[in-house]
Interface confidence: medium
Amino acid sequence: LQEKIEEIAAKYKHLVVKKCCYDGVRINHDETCEQRAARISVGPRCVKAFTECCVVASQLRANNSHKDLQLGR
């Protein structure tokens, strides 16, 4: 799981955008990926990175019985 996320995050070279990806990866079932992404005001590149990483991480967890995937700062 972590390898796959790192692979996706590596696409984002800008540190701010990369952080947006990691923010999306963090487990948060208070709202869906789309709902959370809609609240981001940093900019469209951040929204795109957040959404892609959030959805991929959620799908990976769904295929792995939702084991925790806590990626760092």
Epitope: R26, I27, T32, R39, I40
Partner: antibody, heavy 119, light 112 residues
Framework: EMQLVESGGGLVQPGGSLRLSCAAS????????MQWVRQAPGKGPEWVGL??????????QYAASVKGRFTISRDDSKNSVYLQMNSLKTEDTAVYYC??????????WGQGVLVTVSS | DIVMTQSPLSLPVTPGEPASISCRSS???????????IDWYLQKPGQSPQLLIY???NRASGVPDRFSGSGSGTDFTLKISRVEAEDVGVYFC?????????FGQGTKLEIK
């Protein structure tokens, strides 16, 4: 191990105000949404509201029954979330729980604090 | 708001026998990220609610394997394969697919 500890409950007259606090520990507080849920005596739980983490704006959302009267705030430097309750009504009498989806999936609940609104 | 309809509201069970609780939502709780946004909680007398099942079918850490959750979309079920005396309390489902989160009415499980 994550822990949520509420404080500030008590007896207040209708129309009065009260501020509840929730001290969190055992997780990276600033990364997570924080919520309040209440439970009136003999009833089921009722969602009160939430405050989002800064990554998605730190905004708040409330149940229709408390909107305009209750305010949720957070202080990430103190790992604390607050519920300011104004214009309290007798129907606000309940045990108030601080809850979060930090740590394990699903909601983790504090021990709860009783708020009694009565004259 | 999404309405959660839980049944039965009262459930008398003989120890060792199975038990089943249903929760039906007025809208689908399955999001495009593949997750069913529903939890099951047990509130024992005088205690805070405790998580049993998340995501519709994932057993929380420390929860005995006699508890299981199933379903997707709008219909969900919590099953206890063999009820024990310590299982008494009120069981709630909770949807968090959309704000505001909404709870089922609760099912009071009691031992016959």
């Amino acid at each position: 191990e994550m822990q949520l500890v509420e404080s500030g409950g008590g007896l207040v007259q209708p129309g009065g105000s009260l501020r509840l606090s929730c001290a969190a520990s055992g997780f990276t507080f600033s990364d997570y949404y924080m919520q309040w849920v209440r439970q009136a005596p003999g009833k089921g739980p009722e969602w009160v509201g939430l405050i989002r983490n800064k990554a998605v704006g730190g905004t708040t959302q409330y149940a229709a029954s408390v909107k305009g009267r209750f305010t949720i705030s957070r202080d990430d430097s103190k790992n604390s979330v607050y519920l300011q309750m104004n214009s309290l009504k007798t129907e606000d009498t309940a045990v108030y729980y601080c809850v979060s989806r930090a740590g394990p999936p699903g909601l983790s609940w504090g021990q709860g604090v009783l708020v009694t609104v009565s004259s | 708001d999404i309405v959660m309809t839980q049944s039965p509201l009262s459930l008398p069970v003989t120890p060792g026998e199975p038990a089943s609780i249903s929760c039906r939502s007025s809208q689908s709780l399955l999001a495009s990220d593949g997750y069913n946004y529903i939890d099951w909680y047990l509130q024992k007398p005088g205690q805070s609610p405790q998580l049993l099942i998340y995501g519709g079918s994932n057993r929380a850490s420390g929860v005995p394997d006699r508890f299981s959750g199933s379903g997707s979309g709008t219909d969900f079920t919590l099953k206890i394969s063999r009820v024990e005396a310590e299982d008494v309390g009120v069981y709630f489902c909770l949807q968090h697919r959309a704000l505001p989160p909404t709870f089922g009415q609760g099912t009071k499980l009691e031992i016959k």
